[in-house]
Structures are given as structure tokens and as C-alpha cells.
């Protein structure tokens, strides 16, 4: 298989609510016209599936109705967000790309973003 | 370890018809990209078709009009039907798995099965 660099950030924070968006950018040796968008995370060693998407070069990335990932495409750019997080969480999240048409396939595989996710602090009782 | 098992080469007439099968372990079509390579005496391997998970293929220039790639995810099987087969056909197919498996690459393929185009 030939090899593509993907570009993510390194780190993000997620939201008081538990939300977290970063972009995968990766560097499409010509124009696909079907990419696989996934997302792992790896933690004390191990790799887990988050979720993945097929999408069709100009339609919308649509994740499966369960999942807890979002995202919307424009050129050789996805924006993800997964959303659900908590503290537990935390981890590093890895963008992996497959270009599966027009051949030849091309895997690249981005070096992981680092997300924090703090669980909010229970409000105090407040007594008036 | 996905297995990929090739049937239904033989010997055939110039102008005539063949239909290949890969039949695979598991159930690999719904993530990768499934194809049909062959390679000639003293030629290198190329792809002959392909089918994505998501439904496109691609033909090589040379096959075209003749030959047809389709899959049967209830059975993990994959097909090639050749027709108006040529001398030039003359190879040994191979079925190949492209994709990958979380943070591995993964590129499988079948024994081959020999086609032969003659008269």
C-alpha cells in the first residue's frame, strides 16, 4: 500500500460539556473520489476503533446513526468532533485516511491528537 | 489471518468465457478495497479490477468491456467474469484484500489460479 502523510493537532481540549472537534488534513496524491475517515484512540498501549466513515468526494461524511463522531469534509480537509467525552476519556485520538478510489489505494495515518477531557465540577448547593 | 482462495482458471478458446472466484475467510469486503491482479511470463503483477466497499470499480484499459467485477458479501466471495477472452489474457490471476486493520496496513492475497487463452 503507498503511504500519505496526515496532518492533526497535537492537542485539544474538550468542552465543559464534553465536546471536542480537530481537523484531519491529509495529502492527497490525486483527486479520490472515496475516502475512509477513522478514528482510534490509543491508550496505555491499546488501539480501539471510535468510529469511521466513508464518504463519497463532494457528499457529506456520514457516520453511523450510534456513533458518537460528526464530521464535515471540504477538499482534502475533515473536521471531526466526537462528542459524549468524559474524563475517562482522555487519550490519543489517531485520524487514519484510506483513499479507496480511484486505485492505487494510498493508507496514511496521523500521529495522534492528545485530548483532555475534565468532567465539570457538580454545582454547589446554593442556599438564598 | 484472512485467506483469500482463487477457482475457476483453466483453458480456454480465444473469444471464449471464464468466471473467477475468490472466496475469503471472513467477512473483509465491507472495509477494504477487493481486486484482481494478474501476471504474465517475465511481466510484473497489474491490477486487471477492483471494487471498493463503497461500490466503485475501476477496469484496467485493457480488460474493459469484457470483463466484469462483482461481489457477493453473503457468500465473501468476490468474481471475475471474463468474456471475448484473448491470448494475450493468458496469466495467472490473483485475488487481492487492500485496507487496513486499526493501526496496520494489511494486503492480502490468494495462490493465484492460471488462466490460459488458446486455440
Known amino acids: 500500500c503507498k503511504a500519505m502523510h496526515v496532518a492533526q493537532p497535537a492537542v485539544v481540549l474538550a468542552s465543559s460539556r464534553g465536546i471536542a472537534s480537530f481537523v484531519c488534513e491529509y495529502a492527497s496524491p490525486g483527486k479520490a473520489t472515496e475516502v475512509r475517515v477513522t478514528v482510534l484512540r490509543q491508550a496505555d498501549s491499546q488501539v480501539t476503533e471510535v468510529c469511521a466513515a466513508t464518504y463519497m468526494m463532494g457528499n457529506e461524511l456520514t457516520f453511523l446513526d450510534d456513533s458518537i463522531c460528526t464530521g464535515t469534509s471540504s477538499g482534502n480537509q475533515v473536521n471531526l468532533t466526537i462528542q459524549g467525552l468524559r474524563a475517562m476519556d482522555t487519550g490519543l485520538y489517531i485520524c487514519k485516511v484510506e483513499l479507496m478510489y480511484p486505485p492505487p489505494y494510498y493508507l496514511g495515518i496521523g500521529n495522534g491528537t492528545q485530548i483532555y477531557v475534565i468532567d465539570p465540577e457538580p454545582c454547589p448547593d446554593s442556599d438564598f | 489471518e484472512v485467506q483469500l482462495v482463487e477457482s475457476g482458471g483453466g483453458l480456454v478458446q480465444p473469444g471464449g468465457s471464464l468466471r473467477l472466484s475468490c472466496a475469503a475467510s471472513?467477512?473483509?469486503?465491507?472495509?477494504?478495497?477487493m481486486g484482481w491482479y494478474r501476471q504474465a511470463p517475465g511481466k510484473q503483477r497489474d491490477l486487471v479490477a477492483s471494487?471498493?466497499?463503497?461500490?466503485?470499480?475501476y477496469y484496467a484499459d485493457s480488460v474493459k468491456g469484457r470483463f466484469t467485477i462483482s461481489r457477493d458479501g453473503a457468500k465473501n466471495t468476490v468474481y471475475l467474469q471474463m468474456n471475448s477472452l484473448k491470448p494475450e489474457d493468458t496469466a495467472v490471476y490473483y485475488c487481492?484484500?487492500?485496507?487496513?486493520?486499526?493501526?496496520?496496513?494489511?494486503?492480502?492475497w490468494g495462490q493465484g489460479t492460471q488462466v490460459t487463452v488458446s486455440s
Open positions: 487481492n484484500a487492500r485496507g487496513s486493520i486499526l493501526l496496520d496496513p494489511i494486503n492480502y
Open positions: 471472513g467477512n473483509i469486503f465491507t472495509r477494504n478495497v
Open positions: 471494487i471498493t466497499p463503497g461500490g466503485n470499480i
